[in-house]
């Protein structure tokens, strides 16, 4: 008799799963030599171990403590860069300024970057067909508690000032619902934090709003002032000329405005 | 079996640039960091930097900072190197390479190298 | 960067004898998980180098057991027990500690 499954509303777990992440955390140690210590194996089998065999609707952050413990790693506190809706440019920023940090330039959201997974109550199945969705299933899901545990635990080790990327294209450019909105904003700690700076990323060439005054911005400000940490806001209105002038500083068309 | 095979010879002039590949085979193109290493005729070997097929993601040497650009096609599983304003000094045999993983462990030397591609920069 | 320093740099051996050759960094290379980051590489005539030895003293798959590495975090030794003719070539080694990885100047070995 075949076994009844479960059907979700989301994509299923992305294919080669194991493999991915195995591989991936090799990668990582390869290329960051100060997280050799990490025994991928065991990264892999506390991975696995937060979601297999558990109900996928019921997933918490403690079933992913073995694995935060695992991969328990130290970024500079005053360099990391949050963002939301605009991963790709935020991923190419922290390409050329080496020395600044988005979660997914950590080992933890490397790992699990762009993947889905989920498992089955009472079989040690990967589920394959189908994961819960966020909206139409669950948000107690592997991959939205994990993403919230690990969002929750890089915002709490932010200090001094902390940067944070928002898509100026978006009709809410900044979104209480987004991950940034939700966790991040809530976790930077107060006696840590001087200043939350927001850099607001225009996607129209003839864009020369000031976006800023945006009322989803001054709603951020606003959460943040009330949580005693200062806000500025800054307007990238050329992002390929932003990120060309961080490649090249010294460029003579980098004093001006981007 | 692994196998890196390299695009053929390149005479250029100084001033010029050059695009080097690297196709790679029996294994899954996006689980394993790309090396590419230089050496000059007579000389030692100079490390110059690494891509991560599947992010994109690259380091370079110092030295090559701005002159250097790696990228990889997933599609073909093909990584290449190019290398701009050349100089007589960049003559040399282009190699990539990449590690061996020792039970879920990289090993930290250059298991696989590719068969080399000498680029002549000469006016 | 660290800077590997190999001795000899050219040495002549007779077939069937023991060959070593030295190697030494300017930073120790043991990492805080217990290896010890050198490699070794034998580069033949006319072709890419071949990994000999990894993590100071661990043979690469396919390499005859006369081939062995061993040394402290500084100083690093690889010996071959009875050369061989085919054993001819460049040898380097490397440090793969950190970035940038080095390679020492290589020794070249001859038969004599």
């Known amino acids: 008799v075949p076994r009844w499954r479960q059907q979700w509303s989301g994509p299923g777990t992305t294919k080669r799963f194991p493999e991915t992440v195995l591989a991936r955390c090799v990668k990582y140690t390869e290329i960051h030599p100060e997280m050799r210590h990490v025994d991928c194996q065991s990264v892999w089998d506390a991975f696995k171990g937060a979601f297999i065999s558990k109900h996928p609707c019921n997933i918490t952050e403690e079933d992913y403590q073995p694995l935060m413990k695992l991969g328990t790693q130290t970024v500079p506190c005053n360099k990391i860069l949050l963002w939301s809706r605009i991963k790709d440019l935020a991923h190419q920023f922290t390409q050329v300024q080496r020395d600044m940090f988005t979660l997914e330039d950590t080992l933890l959201g490397y790992l699990a970057d762009d993947l889905t997974w989920c498992g089955e109550f009472n079989t040690s199945k990967i589920n394959y067909q189908s994961c819960p969705d966020w909206r139409k299933d669950c948000s107690n899901n592997p991959v939205s508690v994990f993403w919230k545990t690990v969002s929750r635990r890089f915002a709490e080790a932010a200090c001094d000032v902390v940067h944070v990327m928002l898509n100026g294209s978006r009709s809410k450019i900044f979104d209480k619902n987004s991950t940034f909105g939700s966790v991040e904003v809530h976790n930077l700690q107060p006696e840590k934090v001087q200043t939350l700076e927001a850099w607001v990323i225009h996607g129209g060439r003839e864009d020369s709003r000031d976006l800023c005054q945006d009322p989803t911005i001054k709603e951020l400000e606003s959460i943040i002032s009330k949580r005693n940490i200062q806000f500025s806001c800054k307007n990238i209105y050329r992002p390929d000329k932003f990120l060309q002038c961080v490649k090249n500083p010294e460029d003579s068309s980098c004093t001006s405005e981007i | 079996q692994v196998q890196l095979v390299q695009s053929g010879a390149e005479v250029k002039k100084p001033g010029a640039s050059v695009k080097v590949s690297c196709k790679a085979s029996?294994?899954?193109?996006?689980?394993?960091?790309m090396h590419w290493v230089r050496q000059a005729p007579g000389q030692g070997l100079e490390w110059m930097g690494w891509?991560?097929?599947?992010?994109?993601?690259?380091d370079y040497a110092q030295k090559l900072q701005g002159r250097v650009t790696m990228t990889a096609d997933t599609s073909t599983s093909t990584a290449y190197m190019e290398l701009r304003s050349l100089r007589s000094d960049d003559t040399a045999v282009y190699y990539c390479?990449?590690?061996?993983?020792?039970?879920?462990?990289?090993?930290?030397?250059?298991?696989?190298w590719g068969q080399g591609t000498l680029v002549t920069v000469s006016s | 960067d660290i800077v590997m320093t190999q001795t000899p740099l050219s040495l002549s051996v007779t077939p069937g004898q023991p060959a070593s050759i030295s190697c030494q960094s300017s930073e120790s290379l043991l990492h805080s998980n217990g290896k010890t980051y050198l490699n070794w590489y034998l580069q033949k005539p006319g072709q890419p180098p071949q990994l000999l030895i990894y993590w100071m003293s661990t043979r690469a798959a396919g390499v005859p057991d006369r081939f062995s590495g061993s040394g402290s975090g500084t100083d690093f030794t690889l010996k071959i027990s009875r050369v061989e003719a085919e054993d001819v070539g460049v040898y380097y080694c490397?440090?793969?500690?950190?970035?940038?990885?080095?390679f020492g100047q290589g020794t070249k070995l001859e038969i004599k």
């Open positions: 390479a990449r590690v061996a993983i020792i039970t879920t462990v990289a090993s930290g030397g250059f298991a696989y």
């Open positions: 490397q440090q793969f500690l950190e970035y940038p990885p080095t």
């Open positions: 029996g294994y899954t193109f996006t689980d394993y960091i």
């Open positions: 891509i991560d097929p599947e992010y994109g993601s690259t």
